[in-house]
Every structure is written in structure tokens, then in C-alpha cells.
């Protein structure tokens, strides 16, 4: 992948749009199809005041931890769906798209050099544990996915891409 492909805002917007479409397809978060068990996901709420003051290395840690947990969550949802008696085709399609999207985004971030930010010297303070929450519907899962992309991921890539432009 070209090193700065993720710096083209249209790339991230495409994945955000896919996640929002998936959320809409699941017919609302109150009455939509439920997960047979609760799944742990990252808390996507961004404290903008705190985020702006974080070093880019700290932001990278939050983004990588979030991406990792989100990938696990969607794979878990895929497994739950596979074990259900009659999984809706559209739901399977959106789960597959989300898994593919997360893999692509992970690759694009690696190419951007974001993983280098994680190599902190041994004497640095360990990162605060990732805040998490649980979801019980596919709609909520897709909403978390969309919010993570348009929140922490977008803010982080924006900062890294801006630095690279200088």
C-alpha cells in the first residue's frame, strides 16, 4: 500500500460509511438482531480536551488497543452468527466487510509507521488501561465500529498525516 494512503480522507470515509450502513441495516439499536452473548468493545467516547493534550505516542497506543479489541469483537460476532440457526445474509455480509475493513486499516496504519509509536522506552509510564464497555446487539457493535473510526482513529491519523506534511 502507498505509505500515506490513509492520509487521503476519502479512504477512511469509505470505511466509516460502510460501518454506518451496517448500523442502519440492523434496524435500530433497540429492536435489531441481538448477539447471543455480550461482547466487550472499546469505549469510543473521545475526551477531546484530554486527547488534544496527549502525545502522539499515547494516542497511538489507544488507537492500536482499540483496533485490536474491535477486531476481536467483530470476529467473535462472526463466530456467534455462524453458530446461529438462520443467520441473515445481509448481516453476514456486513460482518465480513467490517473484518476486511479492519484488516485493511491495520495494514494502512502499519505502513504509516504508527506501530513505531508503540516502542516506548522501558522507563516510561505504562499506558492507562483501555476503557471498555459491552454490547448486546449487532447494531451497537457496528455503531462502536463507526464511532471508533470517526473518533480516535480519524483524530490520530489526522495528526500523524499533518506531521508528515511538514
Amino acid at each position: 500500500a502507498p505509505p500515506r494512503l490513509i492520509c487521503d480522507s476519502r479512504v477512511l470515509e469509505r470505511y466509516i460509511l460502510e460501518a454506518k450502513e451496517a448500523e442502519n441495516v440492523t434496524m435500530g439499536c433497540a429492536e435489531g438482531p441481538r448477539l447471543s452473548e455480550n461482547i466487550t468493545v472499546p469505549d469510543t467516547k473521545v475526551n477531546f480536551y484530554a486527547w488534544k493534550r496527549m502525545e502522539v505516542e499515547e494516542q497511538a497506543i489507544e488507537v492500536w488497543q482499540g483496533l485490536s479489541l474491535l477486531s476481536e469483537a467483530i470476529l467473535q460476532a462472526q463466530a456467534l452468527l455462524a453458530n446461529s440457526s438462520q443467520p441473515p445474509e445481509t448481516l453476514q455480509l456486513h460482518i465480513d466487510k467490517a473484518i476486511s475493513g479492519l484488516r485493511s486499516l491495520t495494514s494502512l496504519l502499519r505502513v504509516l509507521g504508527a506501530q513505531k509509536e508503540l516502542m516506548s522506552p522501558p522507563d516510561t509510564t505504562p499506558p492507562a488501561p483501555l476503557r471498555t464497555l459491552t454490547v448486546d446487539t449487532f447494531c451497537k457493535l457496528f455503531r462502536v465500529y463507526a464511532n471508533f473510526l470517526r473518533g480516535k482513529l480519524k483524530l490520530y491519523t489526522g495528526e500523524v498525516c499533518r506531521r508528515g506534511d511538514r
Partner: antibody
Framework: QVQLVQSGAEVKKPGASVKVSCKAS????????MSWVRQAPGQGLEWMGW????????NYAQKFQGRVTMTRDTSISTAYMELSRLRSEDTAVYYC?????????WGQGTLVTVSS | SYELTQPLSVSVALGQTARITCSGD??????VYWYQQKPGQAPVLVIY???KRPSGIPERFSGSNSGNTATLTISRAQAGDEADYYC???????????FGGGTKLTVLG
Amino acid sequence: QVQLVQSGAEVKKPGASVKVSCKASGYTFTSYYMSWVRQAPGQGLEWMGWINPLKGNTNYAQKFQGRVTMTRDTSISTAYMELSRLRSEDTAVYYCAREGMYFDIWGQGTLVTVSS
Amino acid sequence: SYELTQPLSVSVALGQTARITCSGDSIGDKYVYWYQQKPGQAPVLVIYDTNKRPSGIPERFSGSNSGNTATLTISRAQAGDEADYYCQSWDLDFNTYVFGGGTKLTVLG
């Protein structure tokens, strides 16, 4: 104590520019972002933009893009907000506000009157 | 761009509970801040991170947030609570802060 002291009231003609200053004291100026918020008479609060005093980078509300410029002078711990091409609707009290975990410290406000 | 909508005014009887709402698309997915402003004064924060109180703010002030509505609740309303109240959050699409239009709280009696 921690405080933000703003420059005095201004009267300007339409089309002119105004530059409001905000002097910080009692804390490390470069450790906190600074936002500017305005309030027209009898109206609500309107966020205009922020500046990072350490690096000088800024982000402006869409509404003010192209008309507002936020700068700082770290040597005197002062932030500035300049608004150009003034119109009568720009008549307002302009506040600087320090960003801690929220807008925790506010200046006393500067009344800018735009009148022909 | 992201918008926050508040009722223009809310009235409450002295000693009763006032609720001020702030509506915005999926605001439940964001942190919300509430500011109190009295005439001729700069705003003062009463709730941050949706439901936390800064030191010096009475326990009577609380906040909640779910779905498309955030709420500031003032229990046992006092005459001194009369003020304008503003909710605030941010627009992640532009990395900008957003204020609601403000609500004038009147304490009757």
C-alpha cells in the same frame, strides 16, 4: 492565582478589523490550549476556534474560517484573536477560555461594538 | 455540522427538580459539558464528562446522557440557580467545539 486578563472594549466601523488580547498568569501558558468564545447581546455562546500556545497550530469554526486569526506570544504569555471584515452582527463580548479538562478559566470578556 | 438543541426556557418551583435537555444526533456517544452563566458574568462549568461535578459545585447538580438527549438535573432548586445554562460537546467531523443555544432557568416562588 490563575487568571486570564483581556484587553479593553473596542468600537469599530464595519469592514475594519479588531485584535483582542488575553494575558495568562499563574500557570504555564504553553501547557494549555486556548479557545475563543463569543456572545452577542442577549444571545448564546458561540465557539470560534482554538490555538495550541506551544506549537501555534490553530483550528477555527467553519463560520469564521478566512476571517479569524489566532496567534500567541509565548514570551509574554498572551493569546490574540483578530477578526477582520467586521459586520454589525459581530457586536459581541469576546471571551478567551483556557482548556483544562474543560473550559476551566475564562477571561473577563471584551466587548466589541461594530457600528457605523 | 453538528448541532445541539436546548429549550429556550425552563421554569421550576423553589425546592423542586429542574431538568434541562440538550438534543443532538447520537449525543449519547459523546461527552457533554454544562455551563451556568449569570448576567454580566463569564460562564462557570457545573458538569463535565457528562456526569462529573467539579469541586465547589453542589451535589444537587447532576448530568446524564443517552441516545439523542443529554440532561442536566438540578434538584432542590434554589433562587441562586436562576441563570442561563449551556450544554457543550464537539463535532468530530471538524474537530470543533459546539454549544447548545442555551436555556434560561427561572425559579418560581
